[in-house]
């Protein structure tokens, strides 16, 4: 069964800067990745970035840089200042649309005990929804 993992890390140098990494563990090719915060995309969450293998990448503040790390994983740097800045308990969600398998989504947040700049290794997060 395909799985999605989400890793959230706060940068040690900038405490309002977060790095979100997400990956898809499945055999299909990725057709779209959507990163949101505040909950799953379409369920109250706000879209931060959308990545498409051919058409490119779209990102919205406070997203600073979204990119493909591999064919099945992405990273997103958020830089916050003011009302739109993320906080330590913010939930980030990644939805992978895989062709032809369907859509898989998982969410994660900063581990409560983590020091800035440190985080647990990426492990599959609970799958919230499979379309």
């Amino acid at each position: 069964t395909p799985e999605v993992w989400v890793q959230v890390r706060m940068e040690a140098t900038e405490l309002s800067s977060f790095t979100i990494r997400c990956g898809f563990l499945g055999s299909g090719s990725i057709s779209l990745v959507t990163v949101s915060w505040g909950g799953p995309n379409g369920a109250g969450g706000t879209t931060l970035a959308v990545l498409h293998p051919e058409r490119g990448i779209r990102q919205w503040a406070p997203a600073r840089q979204a990119r493909w790390e591999t064919q099945s994983s992405i990273s997103l740097i958020l830089e916050g200042s003011g009302a739109s800045s993320p906080c330590a308990n913010t939930t980030f969600c990644c939805k992978f649309a895989s062709f032809p398998e369907g859509s898989w989504e998982a969410c994660g947040s900063l581990p409560p005990s983590s020091d800035p700049g440190l985080s647990a290794p990426p492990t599959p997060a609970p799958i919230l929804r499979a379309d």
Epitope: S29, E54, R55
Partner: antibody, heavy 118, light 107 residues
Framework: EVQLVESGGGLVQPGGSLRLSCAAS????????MHWVRQATGKGLEWVAG???????YYPGSVKGRFTISRENAKNSLYLQMNSLRAGDTAIYYC????????????WGQGTTVTVSS | DIQMTQSPSSLSASVGDRVTITCRAS??????LGWYQQKPGKAPKRLIY???SLQSGVSSRFSGSGSGTEFTLTISSLQPEDFATYYC?????????FGGGTKVEIK
């Protein structure tokens, strides 16, 4: 209500220039990709330009180097500067929003007519 | 560039008929395809996006299917207001390209 209103069309001679405008309202204009699509009388739809929320621009080969798409987010406005116009550019020009990127245009204006003729 | 071949270019049908329009992409586009309806003198209106998702406010008699290179728009029971021209659009890669259109006329 989401609305797009084009203006600036008219009659122009071959080799001339024209600038089309599109006024957007009812949505957060700065977030969305925007496009121009044209349709010659009795013909099909042809995509002629696109611009993303970061200002990067995209064109088909048929207009590259002649047409320039731009946006002014503070004025909720989209533009199409058309230079070196040809008779084949005669068409209705539609402004369109791609509100759910990358799923194509979801909202269209009513169009403005461009006629290139001597 | 990706070519979109739409068929038929025109068809005649009666109210209540089931109508099927096909779009074929020159290369795989996954499910990055939309369907549009256009009536004379009007702007196009999106019916379907992402190959099979129904646009909000559009009647459920319209449905889309397919992936990869073969796509279909189906009108389950043609209504008088459905007589129009239909276009497919691939949004998989630039340049964005439309099919040539299918004119649905009254038989």
């Amino acid at each position: 209500e989401v609305q797009l209103v084009e203006s600036g069309g008219g009659l122009v001679q071959p080799g001339g220039s024209l600038r089309l405008s599109c006024a957007a309202s009812g949505f957060t204009f700065s977030r969305d990709d925007m496009h121009w699509v044209r349709q010659a009388t009795g013909k099909g739809l042809e995509w002629v330009a696109g611009i993303d929320n970061a200002g990067d621009t995209y064109y088909p080969g048929s207009v590259k180097g002649r047409f320039t798409i731009s946006r002014e987010n503070a004025k909720n406005s989209l533009y199409l500067q058309m230079n070196s116009l040809r008779a084949g550019d005669t068409a209705i020009y539609y402004c369109a929003r791609e509100g759910q990127w990358p799923y194509g245009m979801d909202v269209w204006g009513q169009g403005t007519t461009v006629t290139v003729s001597s | 560039d990706i070519q979109m071949t739409q068929s038929p270019s025109s068809l005649s049908a009666s109210v209540g008929d089931r109508v099927t329009i096909t779009c074929r992409a020159s290369q795989g586009i996954r499910n990055d395809l939309g369907w549009y309806q256009q009536k004379p003198g009007k702007a196009p209106k999106r019916l379907i996006y992402s190959a099979s998702s129904l646009q909000s406010g559009v009647s459920s008699r319209f449905s889309g299917s397919g992936s990869g290179t073969e796509f279909t728009l189906t009108i389950s029971s043609l209504q008088p207001e459905d007589f129009a021209t239909y276009y497919c659009l691939q949004s998989n890669s630039y340049p964005l390209t439309f099919g040539g259109g299918t004119k649905v006329e009254i038989k």
